[in-house]
Interface confidence: low
């Protein structure tokens, strides 16, 4: 039969500094021995030799001594190349050329990537800001690859596209530092977010800055809360921020503060007649008494539960009054999925197997994605169920039915849509008669 050389169609994505495997396989004929094998790995464009195997032995690396074959696997037709300590300069196409009696070759692409750091934000000018002032916000993120895509948005998530200047500079290692500058005219207050996206890793690095300009005293009470929901993990404490603008000469004796559930109007906590009236909500709330006089009416909610999720209203009454609602979004991370296989022994190509992916005690409901070893989504024959326990936390069970090929890796990704937390599990099934899990 004709010699077939196979490589992955999709680029191999490797992080800078890690090791990458450039997969290549060929179909050895019966009676094949390594003495017959001639294998060359070379750079596709320049034809520079990278690694070779000839005359029955590994001829070694011709590429900075950072490559290796898998000698124990060559006889089975596995000509894959291990590239160590990947650098930006390694990016490109590598050709695997196999010559026995017949010959064949195929090229595999290496896509190098490096995650961007969490952006740092600077403000110029950074003090005595008033509405109407023009400020320059700089967002800087470092040591990523390839070039980033930078997005700015305001507190409502509305894109800010005007007056943005982004520059990207590569260092000696080829990694990029990105600096993006946004010029804005301040409103009454505002949150400005910068998102630096690595388009290969689909990794987003976020930072934001909230600017509250000083105001001229007007006598009106202005109550301010974050525009975005407060996200809190189950079992942790959450701060529902609320602030108001006290007039000169303000004293706590004048303050009437009520926190209540926005929908039911159930009282949560109050401060009246110059003192904290305490929690009316399962004794799990507290104010920040030392900060009230400065206009900080924030509420601490302890040991957050799923049932706490919703909108809380902060109502401030002095001579004037005002209120604002803040949303609490409760979340709990999903556990690393456990994978089970049915049937789980004596598996052969063509068998239909049921792979179950189970992840526990998350909130809110998960999104489940399956994919094969090449990262191609598997959307058919998937059944996902989610059940809430007494605490409102979800256990997710996703079942994939698949017909086995010669071998295959099946990955399950359980995403918490609020935390943007991904929990992964995978199972690799080889085409030889096998048992799962593998026996020792």
């Amino acid at each position: 039969g004709a010699l077939e050389v196979q490589v992955p169609e999709d680029p191999v994505v490797a992080l800078v500094g890690t090791d990458a495997t450039l997969c290549c396989s060929f179909s050895p004929e019966p009676g094949f021995s390594l003495a017959q094998l001639n294998l060359i790995w070379q750079l596709t464009d320049t034809k520079q030799l990278v690694h070779s195997f000839a005359e029955g032995q590994d001829q070694g690396s011709a590429y900075a001594n950072r490559t290796a074959l898998f000698p124990d696997l060559l006889a089975q037709g596995n000509a894959s190349l291990r590239l160590q300590r990947v650098r930006v300069a390694d990016e490109g196409s590598f050709t695997c050329f196999v010559s026995i009696r017949d010959f064949g070759s195929a090229a595999v692409s290496l896509q190098v990537a490096a995650p961007y750091s969490k952006p740092s934000m600077t403000l110029e000018p950074n003090k005595d800001l008033r509405p109407g002032d023009t400020v320059t916000i700089t967002c800087s993120s470092y040591q990523g690859y390839p070039e980033a895509e930078v997005f700015w948005q305001d507190g409502q998530g509305v894109p800010l596209t005007g007056n943005v200047t982004t520059s990207q500079m590569a260092n000696e290692q080829g990694l990029f530092d990105v600096h993006s500058i946004l010029r804005v005219v301040l409103g009454a207050n505002g949150t400005y977010s910068c998102l630096v996206r690595n388009p290969v890793l689909q990794q987003d690095a976020h930072s934001s800055v909230t600017i509250t300009p000083q105001r001229s005293p007007t006598g009106a009470v202005e109550v301010q809360v974050p525009e975005d929901p407060v996200v809190a993990l189950v079992g942790t404490d959450a701060t529902l921020r609320c602030s108001f603008s006290p007039e000169p000469g303000f004293s706590l004796a004048q303050l009437n503060l009520i926190w209540q559930l926005t929908d039911t109007k159930q009282l949560v906590h109050s401060f009246t007649e110059g003192r904290d009236q305490g929690s009316a909500y399962a004794n799990r709330t507290a104010l920040f008494p030392d900060l009230l006089a400065q206009g900080n009416a924030s509420l601490r909610l302890q040991r957050v539960r799923v049932a706490d999720e919703g909108s809380f209203t902060c109502f401030v009454s002095i001579r004037d009054f005002g209120s604002a609602a803040v949303s609490l979004q409760v979340a709990a991370p999903y556990s690393k999925p456990s994978m089970t296989l049915e049937p789980n022994k004596d598996l052969r190509p063509g068998d239909t197997v049921t792979i179950t992916c189970s992840s526990y005690r998350g909130y809110p409901e998960a999104e489940v994605f399956w994919q094969d070893g090449q990262g191609v989504p598997l959307t058919g024959n998937v059944t996902t169920s989610q059940m809430a326990n007494e605490q409102g936390l979800f256990d997710v069970h996703s079942v994939l039915r698949v017909v086995l090929g010669a071998n295959g890796t099946y990955s399950c990704l359980v995403r918490n849509p609020v935390l943007q937390q991904d929990a992964h599990g995978s199972v690799t099934i080889t085409g030889q008669p096998m048992t799962f899990p593998p026996e020792a």
Partner: antibody, heavy 118, light 106 residues
């Protein structure tokens, strides 16, 4: 104010080629991904192509690969779509749209019409 | 590719009436966006990332959903809301649109 103005639509014979342009203003063009989306005579919307802010990453649906080429000139704030081997099924209004994070199309041009007919 | 099915294909509502239209995906998607198109005009973004209101869109519009089931709601129908509404998924390439729901005023 964000403005996207497409041009270049025309009547073309089957097998012919055409290049569409989209002039952008009112935002920092070089910071945003851009896309082409078309609307067929039966009013269905179809994504045609996407290009990242720096032009490094380009995506097409399989049905358009090889025949359509998206490109951009950030110095000129202009997006392009080169089309070849045109067929009657390519008859549509072609819209250029700014593409936020490759998630959604936040601003659209007024469209330019391509008719493929003998 | 992910197929989006919008229902109903055509509907009508009286001014002040609550309107809900749905978009069903053939497999789970991460985000859904919604666009409004009036005859002779280009589409306009209404809702992004499933539930966020685009700039300048009236608060009577809202979006919700997850997994394979999404909806667009108009709390009180107004004459200017008569248009065709399209959903669009972001989860996997190719990005796809629904076939549209035509909303008419009674």
């Amino acid at each position: 104010e964000v403005q996207l103005v497409e041009s270049g639509g025309d009547l073309v014979k089957p097998g012919g080629s055409l290049k569409l342009s989209c002039a952008a203003s009112g935002f920092t063009f070089s910071s945003y991904g851009m896309s082409w989306v078309r609307q067929t005579p039966d009013k269905r919307l179809e994504w045609v192509a996407t290009i990242s802010s720096g032009g490094s990453y380009i995506y097409y649906p399989d049905s358009m690969k090889g025949r359509f080429t998206i490109s951009r000139d950030n110095a000129k704030n202009t997006l392009y779509l080169q089309m070849s081997s045109l067929q009657s099924e390519d008859t549509a209004i072609y819209y250029c749209a700014s593409d936020y994070g490759s998630r959604y199309f936040d601003y659209w041009g007024q469209g330019t019409t391509l008719t493929v007919s003998s | 590719q992910i197929v989006l099915t919008q229902s109903p294909a055509i509907m009508s509502a009286s001014p002040g009436e609550k309107v809900t239209m749905t978009c069903s995906a053939s497999s789970s998607v991460i985000y859904m966006s919604w666009y409004k198109q009036k005859p002779g005009s280009s589409p306009r973004l209404l809702i992004y990332d499933t539930s966020n209101l685009a700039s300048g869109v009236p608060v009577r519009f809202s979006g919700s959903g997850s997994g394979t089931s999404y909806s667009l709601t108009i709390s009180r129908m107004e004459a200017e809301d008569a248009a065709t509404y399209y959903c669009q998924q972001w989860s996997s390439y190719p990005r796809t649109f629904g076939g549209g729901t035509k909303l008419e005023i009674k």
